[in-house]
Interface confidence: medium
């Protein structure tokens, strides 16, 4: 059969109807970032409280990320969401403290509950606080007389924070 | 309408606390933060910080040992204070809204002027 | 921090004249720019965000343009309310910090 001559258009470009079935280049603001294509996308525009990451080109969409103070959430960073200081959690009243038993150690996210150190058959090394998990050690069992050598516990965690975190902190 | 008035003593002597209140009216706190900002006379805009309607601040590092931004929803005041002040805190002093759906000051307050001086 | 450098510091013009500011950032601030516009004894007023978009009830003679680090608002045909003094921002990253200010004057 017939080859289908819009298969000849590379990414960046589209197969224009309008002019013989020629490959035309994207017009600005446009994409597309795969051959063959009969319209380009529109890219997209990181306004508000997005900004961008990575800007449109002929053959990729623009990414955002989100302004200082917010950062993002859902796929391709689709909204942007309050930071809250380490030790508290978002809710629809702001940003308010973890609980007793539960912390956070990002601006963002959830207020979760400390390890239960006894789970594990282990006793608790450091307490835990509003922005840092309790430190298990070992168990109780390792420490009685004539034990052998107890390897030290891991260090605490440093704060964590997602690439998705801001940056010019 | 969507107000925000600035209040608060217009000198304070060198080393003293300098304390500011904006109130504000006609919009919704929980979708908005509230800047501060200060101009001293005849000069440019300095951005001192931000606090978002969560209750997090952001400040400027050239003020951050000396500034606190709190609010007090149930009077719908936003404070600022600047500690250790000397006459280069002369300026006039603005608060200014911004939504959570654009980083833009989108109404400001008429400004209060401050004086440091002895 | 970011340094935002405004050209002219001041420039003259007449009702219907086009205007152009430009506003240069020390560093790459993607389109993260407002402007502002400032009349004597008064608060400043919201032009233009995101580089190119301008705040509600904005006239339209105001447009802003640019990305990365160069960046310019245009008044297409100037009125006399128009008379005052333009900053712009950007909001990149903290410090958000302002240009020193552009004044237009009456020709």
């Known amino acids: 059969g017939l080859q289908d001559p819009c298969s000849n258009c590379p990414a960046g470009t589209f197969c224009d109807n309008n002019r013989n079935q020629i490959c035309s280049p994207c017009p600005p603001n446009s994409f597309s970032s795969a051959g063959g294509q009969r319209t380009c996308d529109i890219c997209r525009q990181c306004k508000g409280v997005f900004r961008t990451r990575k800007e449109c080109s002929s053959t990729s969409n623009a990414e955002c990320d989100c302004t200082p103070g917010f950062h993002c959430l859902g796929a391709g960073c689709s909204m942007c969401e309050q930071d809250c200081k380490q030790g508290q959690e978002l809710t629809k009243k702001g940003c308010k403290d973890c609980c007793f038993g539960t912390f956070n150690d990002q601006k963002r996210g959830i207020c979760r509950p400390w390890t239960n150190c006894s789970l594990d058959g282990k006793s608790v090394l450091v307490n835990g606080t509003k922005e840092r998990d309790v430190v298990c050690g070992p168990s109780p069992a390792d420490l009685s007389p004539g034990a052998s050598s107890v390897t030290p516990p891991a260090p605490a965690r440093e704060p964590g924070h997602s690439p998705q975190d801001i940056e010019g902190r | 309408q969507v107000q925000l008035q600035e209040s608060g003593p217009g000198l304070v002597k060198p080393s003293e606390t300098l304390s500011l209140t904006c109130t504000v009216s006609?919009?919704?706190?929980?979708?908005?933060?509230v800047h501060w900002i200060r101009q001293p006379p005849g000069k440019g805009l300095e951005w001192i910080g931000v606090i978002w309607s969560g209750g997090s601040t952001d400040y400027n590092p050239s003020l951050k040992s000396r500034v606190t931004i709190s609010v007090d929803t149930s009077k719908n005041q936003f404070s600022l204070k600047l500690s250790s002040v000397t006459a280069a805190d002369t300026a006039v002093y603005y608060c200014?809204?911004?939504?959570?759906?654009?980083?833009?000051?989108?109404?400001w307050g008429q400004g209060t002027l401050v004086t440091v001086s002895s | 921090d970011i340094q935002m450098t405004q050209s002219p510091s001041s420039l003259s013009a007449s009702v219907g004249d086009r205007v152009t500011v430009t506003c240069r950032a020390s560093?790459?601030?993607?389109?993260?720019v407002a402007w502002y516009q400032q009349k004597p004894g008064k608060a400043p007023k919201a032009l233009i965000y995101s580089a190119s978009y301008r705040d509600s009830g904005v006239p339209s003679r105001f447009s802003g343009s640019g990305s990365g680090t160069d960046f310019t608002l245009t008044i297409s045909s100037v009125q006399p309310e128009d008379f005052a003094t333009y900053y712009c921002?950007?909001?990149?990253?903290?410090?958000?910090?302002f240009g020193g200010g552009t004044k237009l004057e009456i020709k």
């Open positions: 560093q790459n601030v993607g389109t993260n």
């Open positions: 921002q950007q909001y990149n990253s903290y410090p958000l910090t």
């Open positions: 200014a809204r911004n939504p959570l759906t654009a980083t833009v000051m989108d109404y």
């Open positions: 006609g919009f919704s706190l929980i979708s908005y933060g």
